[in-house]
Each structure stands twice: as structure tokens, then as C-alpha cells.
């Protein structure tokens, strides 16, 4: 018969912070490995040292752990315009970012592309460019915002969403077209 584990035994089998349960013996709590190292061998018994080894070049662990392998260092995505802000060390992953006057656009949770901050030509800066957000522009009269650039209302077609902003110009263009066909 397998004895039923009481509340006290359950509590005892949960290790304190900084330790983990030995995978083969849940009565033993082993000390976790420091960041920059990984688990080579579990501790042989209570109060005995865990065998931790330093991560090899090109790999890291950023927090205390009991991982059997270090994590591979990230590579900055050159095709996304990313640059290396700081290189990978045994206890910290590569930090990638963008150049000056660029911002990050996140395509997915872990993938960003660097784009140039809009200069707001034919408009004014409403909000400055930030690390993860493009400049927010307000366009001058006779211009409308398209993909964060101020475009002349002469490029506003009726089907586009610029018609309200460019209504007087649209009417003028329509009038010119009508007078040209009579």
C-alpha cells in the first residue's frame, strides 16, 4: 500500500526558496545553481553541494536555476534592422535594439523591426518618437495622415478615409473635372 501523503509531508516535500526537489528523491532539497551556471549533477544528499558548471561561450542563464543546459544566446536580426546593444554574457542574453532616431515595431511578442521615426514633414510633432512607438504627427491644412506621413490632399481619392479631412479639396477637384468635361 502507498501511504497517503498528509499535509505536513506535502509541505515538507516543497523546498524553500533557492532550492529544488531532487528528481529521484523528493525528500532531498538541492541548492539551485547561480545565474551564469547550469546543473551538471544534482546534490547527492541533504546539505551537500549541487554540481553546477559555468555556461559555455554562446550560452547563458539569467537567473538561479536547475537547468540541464544553458540557453543559447539570442542573435540580433540584421534583416529587421536590429543592432546589438550589449553582447551576451554567461548571465545575460544579448540585448538587441534600434539605431538612433528609430523605433521598434513589434510584429509578434518577441520579434521587432526597426523603422525610422517619422519627421512630420508638412505637419507638426504631436508626440515624440519613443523606443516602441513612432512619432505621432498632426498634419497642416491641405494634408492628411497616411501611414504616419502627411500627404497632400491632392492625393486623396474618394474611396480613401481622407475624404472628411480633405473635403474642400475633393470638392474643388470634382468641380474642375466637371467643368473640364462640358
Amino acid at each position: 500500500l502507498v501511504p497517503h501523503l498528509g499535509d505536513r509531508e506535502k509541505r515538507d516535500s516543497v523546498c524553500p526558496q533557492g532550492k529544488y526537489i531532487h528528481p529521484q528523491n523528493n525528500s532531498i532539497c538541492c541548492t539551485k545553481c547561480h545565474k551564469g551556471t547550469y546543473l551538471y549533477n544534482d546534490c547527492p544528499g541533504p546539505g551537500q553541494d549541487t554540481d553546477c558548471r559555468e555556461c559555455e561561450s554562446g550560452s547563458f542563464t539569467a537567473s538561479e536555476n536547475h537547468l540541464r543546459h544553458c540557453l543559447s544566446c539570442s542573435k540580433c536580426r540584421k534583416e529587421m534592422g536590429q543592432v546589438e546593444i550589449s553582447s551576451c554574457t554567461v548571465d545575460r542574453d544579448t540585448v538587441c535594439g534600434c539605431r538612433k532616431n528609430q523605433y521598434r515595431h513589434y510584429w509578434s511578442e518577441n520579434l521587432f523591426q526597426c523603422f525610422n521615426c517619422s519627421l512630420c514633414l508638412n505637419g507638426t510633432v504631436h508626440l515624440s518618437c519613443q523606443e516602441k512607438q513612432n512619432t505621432v504627427c498632426t498634419c497642416h491644412a491641405g494634408f492628411f495622415l497616411r501611414e504616419n506621413e502627411c500627404v497632400s490632399c491632392s492625393n486623396c481619392k474618394k474611396s480613401l478615409e481622407c475624404t472628411k479631412l480633405c473635403l474642400p479639396q475633393i470638392e474643388n477637384v470634382k468641380g474642375t473635372e466637371d467643368s473640364g468635361t462640358t
Epitope: 515595431h105 513589434y106 510584429w107 509578434s108 511578442e109 516602441k132 497616411r146 501611414e147 480613401l160 478615409e161
Partner: nanobody, 116 residues
């Protein structure tokens, strides 16, 4: 409430084509950049393609460049992905999402199977 509903997946032979659609609601679709991501069995999410708000600028992962085309119809609140010259490695569940945002909203995805 944000809703994204992908469709158009199916079984296709290598070299074949499929057109995926993503019907969006609950947010101002026309103002948002959109993206397609995929997840092959047992693998992580992979970014496929993205498109700016008005569809002028489009972006592709190197693995699909020249074969896939992303487009959108803002009047229908719909995002598309035309996939040509499909390969075995394109087999995955495809999801659409708002890009540049917190990625909290996902549809159920649409499964693309590439097999002879």
C-alpha cells in the same frame, strides 16, 4: 471585444496555393498594422508577414518572400494571405493579430497542411 477569425486553410499538395482570410471586429481595423504568424506542430510561433495600416507597406519573413502576398481590405475589415508555391515546411496553424500591440487577442487559427 476584439475578435479575429481566420479561415481558408486546408490540405494542399506541394507547389499548390491557398488564400487565407482573417475577419476582424471590435477595434479600428483600418488604423492598425496587422500581422500573420504561424505555429508548426511542436514548434514556437514564427512571424510570417505584416502590413501597415493602409496596405501601402508590406513586410515578409525571408522564408516566404516571393511566394506569399499579404493584403487587406479595410472596407471589409479583412486581412488576407495569398500563399503560392507551398512547401512542406509551410504546414502550420496560421494566426492573424494586431501588430505593435499587446498580443492578447488571437483567433482559433486556420490549419494549413502541405502533403502529397
Amino acid at each position: 471585444e476584439v475578435q479575429l477569425l481566420e479561415s481558408g486553410g486546408g490540405l494542399v499538395q506541394p507547389g499548390g496555393s491557398l488564400r487565407l482570410s482573417c475577419a476582424a471586429s471590435g477595434f479600428t481595423f483600418g488604423d492598425d498594422w496587422m500581422t500573420w504568424v504561424r505555429q508548426a506542430p511542436g514548434k514556437g510561433l514564427e512571424w510570417v508577414s505584416g502590413i501597415a495600416a493602409y496596405g501601402i507597406s508590406t513586410y515578409y519573413a525571408d522564408s516566404v518572400k516571393g511566394r506569399f502576398t499579404i493584403s487587406r481590405d479595410n472596407s471589409k475589415n479583412t486581412l488576407y494571405l495569398q500563399m503560392n508555391s507551398l512547401r512542406a515546411e509551410d504546414a502550420a496553424v496560421y494566426y492573424c493579430a494586431e501588430s505593435g500591440k499587446v498580443f492578447d487577442y488571437w483567433g482559433q487559427g486556420t490549419l494549413v497542411t502541405v502533403s502529397s
